[in-house]
Interface confidence: low
């Protein structure tokens, strides 16, 4: 009789990224017998949960169950029923929940408690919901992109060569931008660190990595905008805020109570003689850039070199993958090409920001106005953060690769998180014959 190929034994995993602005559910799959190889896990689905981030449900926790339903039901459809019980589900909450916890540990716990109870109702193997640290977020993002780029193994990867291939095993640095925080993680040239808080040691696939990481809370694009508004309204003589970071002709009313809701604006808080103010866009990149730079305190540095706000940053080394909002914003602005120089990006930003709001609305009719209105700020903020915050230069700009997906998997912390929690990244290089997961337990 002819040999029939046995059905492949596939495993699945689910990670929910509970970010500050929204929650996304990722489904990963991999061949069971290859689970300790590098590069075999890949994403099969992303489901974006309708609504804001979970931290916004603090006053309406009873709605969290319904909020998560659609995407959890989608996971039920995608993953074969026979696999449900052995499919792990993890939820990691990031900076939005870190901020809520700073305001009230009790409220943050209440949200997580309801999230856990909701997710426990599904037929999967729920492993818990927790607020991950900024350091973890940076580290797992770094693991994700280097895992997907095949940097952890000398072996030929199962997928085709990716566009960012540099034909060496030097790892990529990771630049992650969220709504409430931003992370920078890379292997510096000098292995000794002046700041132990920013140092991580990994042994992955038989190799040691000394990694620098830092997460800047309140410097995600949304919280940075709140910070900028709070800073600028201090010097506005009344309830009109002329804002160079919004398109000419753009108008929006902001409640002062909303402005001071976040812990990120506490340092700028003052008693204002009005309850609301109106943003009036004037669309000037240069002035917007100047305003953004005021968010970075570069006058104090207790180390040989700092990023900003007195945080140690070693000299940049190697290539960097910039993902999440770094990618979403630059992709919208059509500025992700490797061929676009930093000077060109700046020139394009100047043009974009100066376009009248009415024109912008017409040109991008399908884009929600809330998001559309903020691309000028976000693009300017990204440039300021990378150049003045992290000290990239016009020359080193070409080492930044704006990455959305690598071989169909989103760049971000979720894959690295799951790989770690499922013990799928061995400390030692596996034998050439793929062995089962239990070998490494």
């Amino acid at each position: 009789t002819q040999n029939k190929a046995l059905p492949e034994n596939i495993k699945y995993g689910i990670v929910l990224d509970a970010g500050s602005s929204h929650t996304s559910l990722y489904i990963y799959k991999w061949p069971a017998e290859k689970e300790n190889d590098t590069g075999v896990v890949h994403q099969v689905e992303e489901c974006r949960v309708k609504g804001p981030g979970i931290s916004k449900y603090v006053q309406k926790v009873n709605e969290i169950g319904i909020y998560l339903t659609d995407c959890m039901e989608r996971a039920r459809e995608v993953i074969p029923r026979s696999q449900h019980q052995e499919t792990p589900v993890y939820l990691g909450a990031t900076a939005g929940m870190r901020l809520l916890r700073m305001e009230s540990e009790e409220l943050a716990d209440r949200v997580l408690d309801v999230v856990e109870r909701s997710l426990s109702n599904y037929p999967f193997d729920f492993q818990g919901a927790r607020i991950i640290t900024g350091q973890e977020e940076g580290a797992y993002g770094w693991i994700t992109i280097n895992y997907l780029l095949g940097k952890f193994s000398q072996k030929t990867r199962w997928f085709s060569i990716v566009p960012y291939e540099t034909n060496n095993q030097e790892t990529f640095g990771a630049l992650d931008l969220g709504g409430a925080s931003t992370q920078i993680t890379f292997v510096p040239q000098n292995q000794t660190t002046e700041s132990p808080d920013n140092a991580l040691q990994f042994r992955l696939y038989g190799k040691d990595y000394n990694v620098y990481t830092h997460s800047f809370l309140c410097y995600g694009k949304d919280q940075a905008l709140w910070q900028k508004l709070a800073k600028d309204i201090q010097v506005a003589s009344n309830e009109i805020l002329r804002d160079p970071c919004f398109h000419p002709g753009y108008k929006k009313v902001v409640n002062v109570s909303d402005l001071y809701k976040t812990p990120c604006t506490k340092r700028f808080e003052m008693t204002l003689p009005f309850q609301q103010f109106e943003i009036q866009g004037i669309g000037n990149y240069q002035q917007c850039h100047q305003s953004v730079l005021e968010l970075f305190n570069t006058s104090y540095c207790p180390y040989s070199q700092c990023a900003f706000n007195g945080i140690f940053l070693p000299p940049l080394q190697g290539d960097f993958g910039a993902f999440s909002a770094f990618y979403f914003v630059m992709n919208f602005l059509n500025l992700t090409s490797e061929k676009v120089s930093q000077e060109k990006v700046t020139e394009m930003m100047k043009k974009f920001c100066s376009q009248p709001w009415e024109e912008i609305k017409t040109s991008y009719a399908g884009v929600k106005e809330k998001y559309l209105s903020e691309y000028c700020f976000s693009g300017t903020y990204i440039l300021s953060l990378l150049l003045q915050g992290y000290h990239f230069t016009a020359d080193s700009w070409e080492h930044i690769h704006f990455i959305g997906k690598i071989q169909g998997s989103d760049a971000g912390w979720t894959l690295g998180y799951m790989l770690n929690l499922t013990n799928m990244i061995p400390a030692e290089q596996p034998l050439s014959t793929p062995l089962s997961h239990s070998t490494y337990v």
């Epitope: 506005a236 009109i240 002329r242 108008k251 866009g281 669309g283 000037n284 009248p356």
Partner: antibody
């Protein structure tokens, strides 16, 4: 080309209310802030207030705050200014004006409406 | 409100330079943009914009008109003055809603 055409001259008694219109042609009023400016005979220009027709939000000068109401009708592309409790010192020419980008060129002005308050 | 103070009157001969000043009670600058505009008004006509953002010439306005200044002190210069320039000139701030100066009456001798 954008044009602002204002309603005709008015004669009112003290204590009465006047409502002046400003019809815009050539562009939608939602693209602008619409301002009203008062000019008494032989006197200077005095800003009264403005409306953002897009969101129906108004701002008024302190001097006129309790007596002026600015409204907009986007269906007819017309802006209105109503001044109540008229007194003789309200005798003036009233102009409507557009402001597309706050603080940049004030694009267009109406021809003005003479309002006379006399018993 | 931001109060604007202008020199009240000026008499100039044709071909000469006319300088009109305007002082604001507080700055009308914001992030490098100066929200000062200048208007010309002739009897029976609405005001006509001459200069915006302190020094930008409005379209269709002769280059004889120029604006300068920042912060709280501003100048409108007409050089050379022509007979047709007899009018009232108003400064206006638009940093914070609108306020006009009291006006400067320019007479050509």
């Amino acid at each position: 080309e954008v044009q602002l055409v204002q309603s005709g001259a008015e004669v009112k008694k003290p204590g009465a209310t006047v409502k002046i219109s400003c019809k815009v042609s050539g562009d939608s009023i939602t693209a602008y802030f619409m301002h009203w400016v008062q000019q008494a005979p032989g006197k200077g220009l005095e800003w009264m207030g403005r409306i953002d027709p897009d969101h129906e939000r108004t701002k008024y000068a302190e001097k006129f705050k309790n007596r002026v109401t600015i409204t907009a009708d986007t269906s007819t592309n017309t802006v209105y200014m109503e001044l109540s409790s008229l007194r003789s010192e309200d005798t003036a020419v009233y102009y409507c004006a557009t402001e597309r980008v706050p603080g940049f060129e004030t694009d267009y002005w109406g021809q003005g409406v003479m309002v006379t308050v006399s018993s | 409100d931001i109060v604007l103070t202008q020199s009240p009157a000026l008499a100039v001969s044709p071909g000469q330079r006319a300088t009109i000043t305007c002082r604001t009670q507080q700055t009308v600058d914001h992030y490098g943009t100066t929200y000062m505009n200048w208007y010309q008004q002739k009897p029976g006509q609405p005001p006509k914009l001459l200069i915006y953002l302190a020094s930008s010439l409005a379209s269709g306005v002769p280059a004889r008109f120029s604006g300068s200044g920042s912060g709280t002190d501003f100048t409108l210069t007409i050089n050379p003055v022509e007979a047709d320039d007899t009018a009232n000139y108003y400064c206006q701030q638009s940093r914070n809603l609108w306020t006009f100066g009291g006006g400067t009456k320019v007479e050509i001798k």
